[in-house]
């Protein structure tokens, strides 16, 4: 047969669907390989085929479009499973081809399978929700398409293995469940199961996430620096190593870039002679506050080193703020022999 | 070590209702789930329901649906367990049973459980 | 609802002999099945879950297997204080269910 461009197999797009739910899945091409949307496709004469390779096998082959209750049907750009089933796991191509004009892209389709409570090995999306921030709301996600906006599903949510009735801050809102006033104790996995008929019979959709509690954009803050400060003085001699810590604590911003850097007389470390080595730690509150503390050390430091400026910088999304270190070279502790004698006036 | 401790046995009417008490000691209460389950005399187990405690999530076998109430109390990390209109098919021990969490279907501990004889 | 049955009611066994029990799903409950075992008097004590993850404090003399609708327990050399009811527990599905148990007796 001629050429086809193949784009591969799109790792980026693993599907996991439940097992025993309906799934549809979209032609990858329309959304992130071609320019144009399926519609012009199709109205230019381009036909969509399906195909897909099972688990553990090489052997492409025909998707069976024949099953009994159409269990798997195509409608436009969509692959549809009334329901999945366990064996439908594998990588699934679909490919957009007329006489003259060839492409393809494959994607790899997990059917998984989650007990009672939802525990499953379903990679979960994260929403993060405001501490103490008023009504914030999450949506039960993935579930448009499904059904015809004349059909009224049933909604139930459910925190771990328990169905949410009567919580205290908790409210299920249909598609929505809101949190009247997130606490940390709000964190957890979250399920929504939706129940829709169709044609006489009944599906469901399980949609599981996990809500994260973390610092309210109202308690934020600039980068407040622990260390260096005034009251801590680095006082070596030369010959001794220098270890100066830069200790930064960053509120948690959404999607904040937390930077923290130290400077040598005004130059990165990176940019000046002397040998410097510098470790980074990054640690995290209960509500995703940072700390990062990177550690500078110059392991043998010079008369030279210890007259330099050494400046911890900080910067997030609220601001930037540096402090200098303050570094001195000791002073030798007096010979009694010679200084002190001197001192008592000795001769 | 966790401990839940169970109130005291009882002897009920038949229509009447029982309400059993498990209090939780040792351990924290928030972040778990706490299950009842009976066992009728020689007989084997059998699942009535459970709660979230730091939420009053509840679930509930739907053999038990509307006679059974689950509920629990944080401040005094104590759950309860109602029955209501009593046959003498209810005569069982009554066990408490902590999941080893909020998403864990298993029990890691249980309480050492109250006999409801239900009885004219 | 799912139908746990466990086989055999009773097995007797001597000390230091292998043990081996039997739970059948009525419908598959991929491995969502947990173990548990009852002394006289007393409250279950959980053994196994995953089908076969031992619990915390679980000698190594108790392994689960299985899959799907048939499950084992296995006890590879009795001691003296193994002589219970074991009861075996899906939660695959809502209600979650037991077994009716197997006595394991001394021959």
């Known amino acids: 047969s001629e050429r086809c461009d193949d784009w591969g197999l799109d790792t980026m797009r693993q599907i996991q669907v439940f097992e025993d739910e309906p799934a549809r899945i979209k032609c990858p091409l329309f959304e992130h390989f071609l320019k144009f949307n399926y519609s012009t496709a199709h109205s230019a004469g381009l036909t969509l085929i399906w195909y897909w390779t099972r688990q553990d096998r090489d052997l492409e082959e025909p998707i069976n479009f024949r099953l009994p209750e159409n269990r798997i049907s195509k409608e436009k750009d969509v692959l549809w499973f009334r329901p999945t089933l366990l064996n439908d796991t594998g990588n699934y191509t679909c490919m957009l081809r007329n006489t003259t004009y060839c492409s393809k892209v494959a994607f790899p389709l997990e059917v998984v399978q989650k007990d009672s409570c939802f525990n499953s090995p379903m990679k979960l999306p994260v929403h993060k929700l405001y501490i103490e921030y008023g009504i914030q709301r999450i949506t039960c996600p993935n579930v448009d398409g499904y059904f015809p906006s004349s059909v009224k599903p049933t909604i139930t949510w459910y925190m771990g293995c328990y169905k949410i009735q009567n919580f205290n801050n908790v409210i299920p809102e249909g598609m929505n469940l809101s949190f009247l006033i997130a606490l940390i104790s709000n964190n957890g996995n979250y399920t929504c199961v939706v129940t829709y008929p169709e044609n006489g019979r009944t599906f469901h959709l399980t949609r599981t996430l996990t809500v994260k509690v973390v610092g309210s954009p109202k308690n934020a803050v600039p980068p407040v620096i622990h260390s260096p400060n005034d009251h801590v003085v680095y006082e070596k001699e030369p010959g001794e190593e220098l270890l100066i810590p830069c200790t930064v604590y960053f509120s948690f911003l959404m999607d904040s870039r937390n930077e923290v850097w130290w400077t040598i007389d005004g130059k990165k470390p990176d940019d000046i002679t002397i040998d410097v080595t510098i470790n980074e730690s990054i640690s995290h509150s209960r509500t995703e506050d940072e700390t990062r503390t990177q550690i500078l050390s110059i392991k043998k430091v010079t008369s030279e080193d210890l007259k330099r400026s050494y400046v911890c910088h900080a910067r997030s999304a609220k601001g930037e703020v540096a402090k200098a270190a303050k570094v001195k070279q000791k002073v030798p502790a007096p010979r009694y022999t010679v200084e002190l004698a001197c001192g008592f006036g000795a001769t | 070590q966790v401990q839940l401790v169970q109130s005291g046995a009882e002897v009920k009417k038949p229509g009447s209702s029982v309400k059993v008490s498990c209090k939780a000691s040792?351990?924290?209460?928030?972040?778990?789930?706490i299950s009842w389950v009976r066992q009728a005399p020689g007989q084997g187990l059998e699942w009535m329901g459970g709660?979230?405690?730091?939420?009053?999530?509840?679930n509930y076998a739907q053999k038990f649906q509307g006679r059974v109430t689950i509920t629990a109390d944080e401040s005094t990390s104590t759950a309860y367990m109602e029955l209501s209109s009593l046959r003498s098919e209810d005569t069982a021990v009554y066990y408490c049973?902590?999941?080893?969490?909020?998403?864990?279907?298993?029990?890691?501990?249980w309480g050492q459980g109250t006999l409801v004889t239900v009885s004219s | 609802e799912i139908v746990m049955t466990q086989s055999p009611a009773t097995l007797s066994v001597s000390p230091g002999e292998r043990a081996t029990l039997s739970c059948r799903a009525s419908?598959?409950?991929?491995?969502?099945l947990a173990w548990y075992q009852q002394k006289p008097g007393q409250a279950p004590r959980l053994l196994i879950y995953g089908a076969s993850t031992r619990a915390t404090g679980i000698p190594a003399r108790f392994s689960g297997s299985g899959s799907g609708t048939e499950f084992t327990l296995t006890i590879s050399s009795l001691q003296s204080e193994d002589f219970a009811v074991y009861y075996c527990q899906q939660y695959n599905n809502w209600p979650w269910t037991f077994g009716q148990g197997t006595k394991v007796e001394i021959k």
């Open positions: 040792g351990g924290v209460f928030s972040g778990y789930a």
């Open positions: 709660i979230i405690p730091e939420f009053g999530a509840t």
């Open positions: 049973a902590r999941h080893s969490s909020a998403y864990s279907p298993w029990f890691d501990y």
């Open positions: 419908q598959s409950v991929s491995s969502n």
